[in-house]
Structure formats: structure tokens, C-alpha cells
């Protein structure tokens, strides 16, 4: 691997305060290309046996400030007849993502990296039936 010489204008990555001085470019680049993103299905939320709705989660002190979150529509799953099946449960599938949270009262703005659990969809699982002793 080629070693890139460190410019004197760049912070020393070995310095203890390096992480306190990192600047992050918040521009989002679509490395997958337009064709991939245009094929994302948005109708699964209705067609699923465990349908969900999407809610616009807003937090002005977070980057990104808008995150769309899934919430299961029912506690149970929907069967082929469109009725709720009491032997099956709808459960939320969650994904852990990294977000930037703005430090309160910081000027200029500084951000800290935080983990966030986001609901991305729902799936259907068998109910746990507890046997009577």
C-alpha cells in the first residue's frame, strides 16, 4: 500500500486531541448509483403479513435530523383472509445506526456520535405458547 505523505496543514493523527478536531463533511454521496435507489420497494409495508406504518422522527439536534421509522400496525399478523391471526405476532425489525448529536450550547456546533435503534420494518413470528404445568 502506498504511504501518503502527511501534509503539514493536516492534523497529526497521533496527537491526543486529534479526535476532538476532526471535521466531517456532511454531504451525502450516493455511491450505489441512481438505479439501485429507484428500485427500493415501498409497498412491502402494506403487502406484508405484519404491515407497518412509517413515522417521521424529527430531532433538530441530530444529523440526520429526519429519520423515517417503522411501527407495526398490529400486535398480531394478518392471514390470507385479511384477518388477524392470534397464533402469530408482528414484531419490529430494528437496525442500529450511527447519528451525530449536536452538543447543547456548543458554539461553534460540535457533534458527538451516538448509536440509535431505528425500526425498519416488521416481520411475523409464531406466538410463544406457554404450556400449563
Amino acid at each position: 500500500a502506498a504511504i501518503i505523505p502527511q501534509s503539514s496543514a493536516c492534523p497529526n493523527t497521533e496527537a491526543k486531541d486529534f479526535l476532538q478536531n476532526v471535521k466531517v463533511n456532511l454531504k451525502v454521496f450516493n455511491s450505489l448509483g441512481a438505479k439501485v435507489s429507484s428500485r427500493r420497494p415501498s409497498d412491502y409495508l402494506n403487502r406484508s403479513t405484519s404491515p407497518w406504518t412509517l413515522h417521521r422522527n424529527e430531532d433538530p439536534d441530530r444529523y440526520p435530523s429526519v429519520i423515517w421509522e417503522a411501527q407495526c400496525r398490529h400486535q398480531r399478523c394478518v392471514n390470507a383472509e385479511g384477518k388477524l391471526d392470534h397464533h402469530m405476532n408482528s414484531v419490529l425489525i430494528q437496525q442500529e445506526i450511527l447519528v451525530l448529536k449536536r452538543e447543547p450550547e456548543s458554539c461553534p456546533f460540535t457533534f458527538r456520535v451516538e448509536k440509535m435503534l431505528v425500526g425498519v420494518g416488521c416481520t411475523c413470528v409464531a406466538s410463544i405458547v406457554r404450556q400449563a404445568a
Epitope: 456532511l26 451525502v28 450516493n30 441512481a34 435507489s37 429507484s38 427500493r40 415501498s42 409497498d43 409495508l45 402494506n46 406504518t53 412509517l54 413515522h55 417521521r56 424529527e58 433538530p60 439536534d61 444529523y63 440526520p64 435530523s65 429526519v66 423515517w68
Partner: antibody
Framework: EVQLVQSGAEVKKPGASVKVSCKAS????????FHWVRQAPGQGLEWIGV????????AYNQNFRDRATLTADKSTSTAYMELSSLRSEDTAVYYC????????????WGQGTLVTVSS | EIVMTQSPATLSVSPGERATLSCKAS??????VGWFQQKPGQSPRLLIY???NRYTGVPARFSGSGSGTDFTLTISSLQPEDFAVYFC?????????FGQGTKLEIK
């Protein structure tokens, strides 16, 4: 070039519904939110709601939650705003506008659709 | 909801002069404020986003400043095409709200 082209003017009677369309071109339709804003004659701008064509999610201004329905058709890259139970005070120009979710601002706007509600 | 109040309602300025438009939010909106220009029969046009960032293609005579609750749009040297209505808008939290507008007219 990004373009948002809206449907033509409509005249409706009180109690009726209207459906305004907004066809997008020049970018990937599913990548950005669509917001709808209206402007009554000589008045300011009022936010109606938002739809994300990529995931189908919607959010509404409480003032419109019961009457407005936002939808999107990915096959034609078109967003729709339907307003029901129209009254005279709904007479306004209705705009669709693209919102850059990550950057956080409205950049492109449709040309507007005048909806007149009159008996 | 957050109320955006613009002042003055009408501003009369001569071409070549400086115009200063004000916008106040009913609560802190950080820097999540945009400024739009609207001419009769036209759609709003984005000028400034995040309080002070000039949008692509907007002339350098337009500048924005402020944070929290007080925001200002300044047009350094008015050109004939600048006479229009200007709106401020917050996208800090929904429902997103707009000011009632300032009409900039030729003196």
C-alpha cells in the same frame, strides 16, 4: 435539470375533493421528500404535509390531517395531494416542493396549481 | 407551532441602496431558517438556507445572518429585479412555518 410540473387550475364546489399532481424529472424521484405548501390569495405560505416516495411515509400538519392525503406513484415519478371536504377558504395556490432531507431545505418548487372553491 | 414574524410588512427602498429584512421566531430554531423570494405569479425561489448559506446561483448581494430567534436578510445594493416579496421559513420542527412576508417596493 430538476423540474417539478404541476397539474392545471381547478374549480370545485364546496364539499367536493380535488387531486393535484406534481411530476418530477431530472433526478431520482425516490431519493427526496415531497412537501406540499399552499398560499391563499395575498397571504403567506402554509405547510400541508410531506411524503417520502422512497418508503411511502407521510406526515401531516394537524390542520390538514383529516382532509389531506398525500400519495406518490414511483412508476410515473408523480406525487399527488388530495384535499377533501373543500370549503371557500381552501381557495389557494398549491405548491409541491422538494426537500433535501439530509441538507434540510426546500430547493425546487412546482409552478403552483390554483384551486378555486366556489358555489 | 413555531410562529415566524417578519418586519416590516412593507419596505420602500431606492435602487442601489441597502435593504434589511427581519424575521423573528417564537422560540429558538437554531440556524434552521431559509429565505425565499417570490414575484407575482411565480413560485418561491430559495435564496438562503441554514440562516446564512447562499443557495447556488444566488447573487452575492444577498446575505443572511442570525441564529436562535432573530434572523436578517440583507440585500447590499438593490437591483430592479430584487423588488418582490420575501419570506422566511423554519424547518427546525414540523409543522414547518413561514413568515407572512415582507414586500420590498421601489421608493
Amino acid at each position: 435539470e430538476v423540474q417539478l410540473v404541476q397539474s392545471g387550475a381547478e374549480v370545485k364546489k364546496p364539499g367536493a375533493s380535488v387531486k393535484v399532481s406534481c411530476k418530477a424529472s431530472g433526478y431520482t424521484f425516490t431519493d427526496y421528500e415531497f412537501h406540499w405548501v399552499r398560499q391563499a390569495p395575498g397571504q403567506g405560505l402554509e405547510w400541508i404535509g410531506v411524503i417520502h416516495p422512497g418508503n411511502g411515509g407521510t406526515a401531516y400538519n394537524q390542520n390538514f390531517r383529516d382532509r389531506a392525503t398525500l400519495t406518490a406513484d414511483k412508476s410515473t415519478s408523480t406525487a399527488y395531494m388530495e384535499l377533501s371536504s373543500l370549503r371557500s377558504e381552501d381557495t389557494a395556490v398549491y405548491y409541491c416542493t422538494r426537500f433535501l432531507t439530509y441538507e434540510g431545505y426546500f430547493d425546487y418548487w412546482g409552478q403552483g396549481t390554483l384551486v378555486t372553491v366556489s358555489s | 407551532e413555531i410562529v415566524m414574524t417578519q418586519s416590516p410588512a412593507t419596505l420602500s427602498v431606492s435602487p442601489g441602496e441597502r435593504a434589511t429584512l427581519s424575521c423573528k421566531a417564537s422560540q429558538s430554531v437554531s440556524i434552521d431558517v431559509g429565505w425565499f423570494q417570490q414575484k407575482p405569479g411565480q413560485s418561491p425561489r430559495l435564496l438562503i438556507y441554514h440562516a446564512s448559506n447562499r443557495y447556488t446561483g444566488v447573487p452575492a448581494r444577498f446575505s443572511g445572518s442570525g441564529s436562535g430567534t432573530d434572523f436578517t436578510l440583507t440585500i447590499s445594493s438593490l437591483q430592479p429585479e430584487d423588488f418582490a416579496v420575501y419570506f422566511c421559513q423554519q424547518d427546525y420542527s414540523s409543522p414547518y412555518t413561514f413568515g407572512q412576508g415582507t414586500k420590498l417596493e421601489i421608493k
